[in-house]
Interface confidence: low
């Protein structure tokens, strides 16, 4: 973009420039060119010896310009077209400038002016051209700067040429206001920062509802001395709730949202959300639906799962295998885990309580991903109720729970009560008892024994009676003895492990 400070041709002769010396040299004249009246300053003192004729412009306000461009259109006659070649004739003129903070009016002093250049024509107008009214127009441009004062004058020094100055245009260059990458760059004076830095770096302003991305570079462009924008750096992005439409950020339409500053468009509100208002940054979940903290806002809202399906409890002596299937309704999530809790009830008193501490699970029961678990170390003649709860990532956001229960009665025998009946140096006589009510269910008793400290081998004796003598034992040795009832359903409860010691060879029975 060019900002014109002075345009002689456009003023149609209304600019009264100062000539020096007064009444000699340069003169304003009107001519017809291409059927149009044109004004020009002309001088043609080619035979009068040395010339020093000055034409000074009016004072020109600099505005924001730091460097100005001066475009001259002129014509020069060929010195050879004058009688005798006019020995003092020249075919060039000089261009000067002077800066000032005030208009000096008619006070003209040559010493205040600095020479810009000698202006020479590319083409001169020879006699034949002149007679055919075919003048050769030359265009020359010069640049001046940096300027620092409020205004300036230009001056043209004639040193004996035949010249007509048809156009003097002074302008400076600006990079025009521009929208790029959602950033508005202001109209900027085209100025070289230095010889080594010919580009001015300009920061852009993000358009309404646009922001510089977090951790990103703000929008920058480079304004060249020629008034052209180059090398964009950084960008602005439409802020949350807004999307890019051409060079602007528009609020997300109702039913759409955008949760962060990004290049992406607004997204449609996901399933199970309420329709959003204009400019939404998120979509609220429908009643009964939720978002886990780690769920992206683009994900459908979900709900806790229903209870697990088809829970079964299969008793196996002192063990129970629990099996279930996944909930019918997963709540729209894949992150389902199961949690098993246990309650035991004494049939005689009807009293119940938790039993997590007394039973053993085949795997930790509070974040199960599989749909089965085995519970062991169950007590005999006890009623157990197991609850299996299904949970997902949003279960923690509601107070209700989704679980199914199954009950099982443990009918295995009570552990036998064992005592040492007799002993010798090589044998131990062991007896036991169980409640009479359970004796009919016992098929045999299994006695397991081994030397204390010997974990690698053990002996097993089976008997239908309530006693056994363990022979061939080592003297003065402690044995670990356990008795277990065997029923049709499998193994009953085992007694606690007892430590019994044979007599030493020197000792006597006690």
């Amino acid at each position: 973009k060019e900002v014109v400070l002075l345009d002689f041709a456009a003023m149609k002769g209304e600019l009264g420039w100062l000539t020096h010396p007064y009444g000699k040299g340069w003169d304003l004249m009107q001519n017809i060119m291409d059927d149009m009246p044109i004004y020009m300053y002309s001088v043609c003192n080619v035979v009068s010896g040395d010339q020093d004729n000055w034409l000074r412009t009016n004072w020109v306000y600099r505005e924001e310009a730091e460097r100005i461009f001066i475009e001259l259109k002129f014509t020069v006659r060929d010195c050879n077209s004058f009688p005798g070649g006019a020995s003092s004739c020249k075919e060039t003129f000089n261009l000067y400038y002077a800066e000032s903070d005030v208009d000096y009016g008619t006070n003209f002093q040559k010493r205040q002016f600095t020479k810009i250049d000698t202006i020479a024509p590319d083409e001169i107008t020879v006699s034949s051209d002149f007679e055919a009214r075919n003048v050769k127009l030359n265009v020359e441009e010069r640049m001046v700067g940096p300027l620092t004062r409020k205004g300036f004058y230009l001056a043209f020094q004639d040193i004996g040429a035949c010249v007509a100055l048809l156009s003097v245009r002074v302008y400076y260059k600006k990079c025009p206001e521009m929208l790029q990458s959602l950033a508005r760059f202001p109209e900027t004076i085209a100025v070289a920062v230095s010889d080594t830095q010919p580009l001015a770096t300009v920061a852009g302003t993000c358009v309404d509802h646009a922001v510089v991305p977090y951790g990103g570079e703000g929008p920058l462009m480079h304004c060249t001395v020629d008034g052209e924008w180059l090398v964009p750096i950084g960008q602005c992005l439409c802020q949350e709730g807004y999307e890019k439409v051409e060079d602007a950020c528009r609020a997300c339409s109702p039913g759409f949202f955008k949760s962060e500053a990004s290049e992406s468009p607004c997204l449609e509100c996901p399933e199970h959300t309420l329709p959003s208002t204009e400019g939404a940054t998120s979509c609220q979940c429908e009643e009964g639906y939720f978002r886990a903290p780690e769920d992206p806002l683009s994900m459908s809202c979900t709900r806790p799962p229903s209870a697990p399906n088809y829970l079964t409890a299969i008793g196996m002596g002192a063990k129970v295998e629990l099996r279930w299937t996944a909930p019918k309704d997963t709540g729209g999530r894949q992150d389902i885990v199961y949690s098993v809790t246990c309650e035991q009830c004494w049939p005689e008193s009807g009293e119940c309580g938790p039993c997590e501490a007394s039973v053993r699970y085949s795997e930790p029961p509070h974040a199960l991903t599989r749909t089965s678990v085995t519970v062991s170390d169950l007590e005999p003649h006890m009623n157990y109720t197991f609850a299996v709860e299904a949970r997902n990532g949003v279960s923690g956001l509601v107070t209700s729970r989704s679980f199914r229960t199954a009950s099982v009665s443990i009918n295995q025998t009570e552990p036998p009560k064992v005592r040492l009946e007799d002993r010798s140096t090589t044998s131990l006589s062991v007896t036991w008892s169980i409640p009479v009510s359970q004796q009919s269910r016992v098929w045999k008793y299994e006695v397991t024994y081994r030397k204390k400290g010997d974990a690698n081998s053990y002996n097993v004796r089976r008997t239908e009676g309530f006693s056994v003598t363990l022979d061939d034992l080592a003297p003065d040795t402690t044995y670990l003895v356990q008795v277990q009832a065997l029923t049709q359903e499998g193994q009953g409860a085992g007694s606690k492990v007892h430590e019994f010691q044979t007599l030493s060879t020197e000792g006597s029975a006690n």
Partner: antibody, heavy 126, light 112 residues
Framework: EVQLVESGGGLVQPGGSLRLSCAAS????????MNWVRQAPGKGLEWVSY????????YYADSVKGRFTISRDNAKNSLYLQMNSLRAEDTAVYYC???????????????????WGQGTTVTVSS | QSVLTQPPSVSGAPGQRVTISCTGS?????????VHWYQQLPGTAPKLLIY???NRPSGVPDRFSGSKSGTSASLAITGLQAEDEADYYC????????????FGGGTKLTVL
């Protein structure tokens, strides 16, 4: 006309609660960050809390942290300050004031609090 | 005790020039944070007077000017008028504080 109007002040006993409101008109409040600033009788200005345009960033002065909660409803062009566990030293005129959104060109935070409400008085006394 | 220090009071005769200083530290003004100035006329809400160290919002007379240097800022009022009698507060930001916003203690300007 751009204006902010506070309401909800009054007399409350120590330990009590109050909720202040600030209604914005004449501009789109969702484009601006907002502040609460208070002024105890005969004293200077004390900044209380800040909330960004989308409520994604919230700050509190140490003196109110854990007791006061700032929030906003952009659909209603409203700003709120929930004040719990009030103390005698919370007695003041409470002003809401808007921030112009910082952006890269203006530099952060080139603009101050350019629009203020008329204030609402909170008195904490037994 | 305010993070930014202002003189409690200044005074001047009509037509005179007065300045109000605002002294901070390396974690606020000295860290490059902008300084804003507010005017609070008696019985009214504060009003933004100077923003971004030296910029005047529209409607603020050019008798008011702001500047900043190092860890300090100052507000200058030339051609003092009776209606300038008010409390003046500087405000900046402090990287060491929660929320960052800090005010000076305020300066009472009396027009003699």
């Amino acid at each position: 006309e751009v204006q902010l109007v506070e309401s909800g002040g009054g007399l409350v006993q120590p330990g009590g609660s109050l909720r202040l409101s600030c209604a914005a008109s004449g501009f789109t409040s969702s484009s601006y960050s907002m502040n609460w600033v208070r002024q105890a009788p005969g004293k200077g200005l004390e900044w209380v809390s800040y909330i960004s345009s989308s409520s994604s960033t919230i700050y509190y002065a140490d003196s109110v942290k854990g007791r006061f909660t700032i929030s906003r409803d952009n659909a209603k062009n409203s700003l709120y300050l929930q004040m719990n566990s009030l103390r005698a030293e919370d007695t003041a005129v409470y002003y809401c004031a808007r921030y112009r959104l910082p952006n890269f060109w203006s530099g952060y935070p080139n603009y101050g609090m350019d629009v203020w409400g008329q204030g609402t008085t909170v008195t904490v006394s037994s | 005790q305010s993070v930014l220090t202002q003189p409690p009071s200044v005074s001047g005769a009509p037509g005179q020039r007065v300045t109000i200083s605002c002294t901070g530290s390396s974690s606020n003004i000295g860290a490059g944070y902008d300084v804003h100035w507010y005017q609070q006329l008696p019985g009214t809400a504060p009003k933004l007077l100077i923003y971004g160290n030296s910029n005047r919002p529209s409607g603020v007379p050019d008798r008011f000017s702001g500047s900043k240097s190092g860890t300090s800022a100052s507000l200058a009022i030339t051609g003092l008028q009776a209606e300038d009698e008010a409390d003046y507060y500087c405000q900046s930001y402090d990287s060491s504080l929660s929320g960052h916003v800090v005010f000076g203690g305020g300066t009472k300007l009396t027009v003699l």
